[in-house]
């Protein structure tokens, strides 16, 4: 339960956060599970642990294996596991499944691929894509924040996208890679269920206290007109209008769009001033049509600009 | 936003047992720690323990080891405290208090007064 | 236990001024990850206790900027520039650092 997958490619930064949270942290240390060797935390070594992340600056092979993080409170100490596995790099074009993330499904217009874990690292805006290895070129493209929006997606554009990073670590670079699926889906006018592309699964959105913060729920339906599509944001399974925050209003994005049929819907959570205590609630982005109701939450987590645990762990 | 709902009064004998309750809404229950604290005229606020509702794992003060029991039920979000072998020294508000990912006791609940008389 | 000591009482103040509150702690507060866990509370007449301060100079959400902190590992002062009718009632400290988790005994503050 307390365990999660993590993997890189050598002679590349990788980032793991500890899959256990603080309720609160004090400290968080880490150990190779295996000789239950302490993981140093000076910057000066090539694995080293900073609070609630541990840093392969860069990874080699031979970093394989489980690392066991303990968040400590005086209350409980709570324990997770990484499971990190490093890899060589492929001398061709082909990335094997087993380096992929999660697949995303396309709607025809600004269609956002997603680069994963990017959040864990100090990165500086553009991104580069790769589609099949191949830099992407021409208008259509448009690298934004930390994702790809392909304009009016054709079936053409499905296929494997990787993300290409620097990560900056004290004044030294390191490249980051990030390959996932792309999937349009391409049917004559038909229903299906809902497929929610943002956000992802039990993803973790950084805010700032005291900034605005916009979730967006992004979700397509299948092909033609829908009888019935709705895509909306719940609070602790509350709807928002239900739920008497006036802080935190959802409004309609990007309605249905039909250049190429597929059908889809956005709805922006906008949450203004974030207080601590929206840390704590569960944000789940419901699509639902007749075929059935599908659920992606998203929970927050805060941003420090300089995070003591980091420093002093 | 986070309420803390506990139960009401209570006037209860002197030797016999009593649970108060505290109902959590507005956040993911298994992501906040429960901690339990008694005030008293005499002894002001004195921590009695708490609960990591994720796990069931507790923690006491060492004042209140065998006083106090605590309980948590993922399924209602309800956090619960036992009183046992009660005294007039037992009687006092009795608050729970829920901790964020920073900090412990950031949320109260309303308290609970507790009368031990015969 | 560490033990939280404050006075009983505050020197009273006249709404509009400054007023400070003290507290003292048996040994430091100060963590080895840097952070001073200190806390302040306001209990004001029949309600529950309400965080205000946290981590010995962090504002708690919805606490107005009037109230402020400072200190050491061990000595430490509860700051507010513009006292408010609302203010009224009994300041707590406490410390976070190690169980068992204790308070002070708490400050009323006391208006002219």
């Known amino acids: 339960k307390f365990s999660k997958q993590s993997w890189g490619l050598e002679n590349e930064a990788l980032i793991v956060r500890c899959p256990r949270q603080g309720k609160p942290s004090y400290t968080v240390d880490w150990y190779y599970s295996q000789t239950n060797k302490s993981i140093p935390t000076q910057e000066r070594n090539r694995v080293f642990a900073s609070g609630q992340l541990l840093k392969f600056l860069p990874a080699a092979v031979a970093d394989s294996g489980i690392y066991t993080c303990i968040v400590r409170s005086p209350t409980f100490n709570r324990t997770g596991y990484a499971n990190v596995t490093i890899y060589k790099k492929q001398s061709d074009c082909n990335v094997p499944d087993y380096l992929m993330y999660s697949t995303v499904s396309g709607s025809e217009k600004n269609s956002k691929i997603y680069c994963p874990t990017i959040d864990l690292y100090n990165w500086t805006a553009p991104l580069e894509w790769f589609k099949n290895c191949q830099a992407l070129q021409g208008s259509r493209y448009r690298a934004h924040k930390s994702f790809l929006v392909i304009d009016n997606v054709m079936t053409e554009d499905a296929g494997d996208y990787t993300c290409k990073f620097i990560h900056n670590e004290n004044g030294a670079n390191y490249s980051v890679t990030a390959t996932r699926s792309f999937t349009v889906k391409d049917e004559q006018g038909f229903s299906l269920f809902p497929v929610i592309g943002a956000p992802a699964q039990n993803e973790i959105k950084e805010v700032e206290i005291g900034k605005n913060a916009n979730l967006t729920c992004s979700a397509c339906f299948g092909k033609g007109t829908q009888f019935l599509a709705a895509v909306l944001w719940q609070l602790n399974g509350t709807k928002i209008t239900d739920f008497g925050e006036p802080r935190i209003q959802q409004e309609e994005g990007q309605n249905q769009s039909f250049s190429n049929g597929l059908a889809c819907l956005d709805m922006v959570l906008r949450i203004a001033d974030v207080k601590e205590e929206d840390l704590l609630l569960q944000y789940d982005c419901l699509a639902l049509n007749l075929h059935g109701l599908r659920r992606h939450t998203v929970r927050l987590s805060r941003k420090n600009p300089i995070d003591h645990h980091s420093i002093y762990c | 936003q986070v309420q803390l709902q506990q139960s009401g009064p209570e006037l209860v004998r002197p030797g016999a047992s009593v649970t108060l309750s505290c109902k959590a809404s507005g956040y993911i229950f298994i992501d906040s720690e429960m901690h339990w604290v008694k005030q008293t005229p005499v002894h002001g606020l004195e921590w009695i323990g708490a609960?990591?509702?994720?796990?069931?794992?507790?923690v006491y003060n060492q004042k209140f080891k065998g006083k106090a029991t605590l309980t948590a039920d993922k399924s209602s979000s309800t956090a619960s405290m036992e009183l046992s072998s009660l005294t007039s020294e037992d009687s006092a508000v009795y608050y729970c208090?829920?901790?964020?990912?920073?900090?412990?006791?950031?949320?109260w609940g309303q308290g609970t007064t507790l009368t031990v008389s015969s | 236990d560490i033990v939280m000591t404050q006075a009983a009482f505050s020197n009273p103040v006249t709404l509009g001024t400054s007023a400070s509150i003290s507290c003292r702690s048996s040994k430091s507060l100060l963590h080895s990850n840097g952070i001073i866990y200190l806390y302040w509370y306001l209990q004001k007449p029949g309600q529950s206790p309400q965080l205000l301060i946290y981590?010995?100079?962090n504002l708690a959400s919805g606490v107005p900027d009037r109230f402020s902190s400072s200190g050491s590992g061990t000595d430490f002062t509860l700051r507010i520039s513009r006292v408010e009718a609302e203010d009224v009632g009994v300041y707590y400290c406490a410390q976070n650092l190690e169980l068992p988790f204790t308070f002070g005994s708490g400050t009323k503050l006391e208006i002219k």
């Open positions: 981590q010995m100079s």
């Open positions: 208090t829920g901790s964020t990912t920073d900090y412990y006791f950031a949320y």
């Open positions: 609960i990591d509702p994720e796990t069931g794992d507790t």
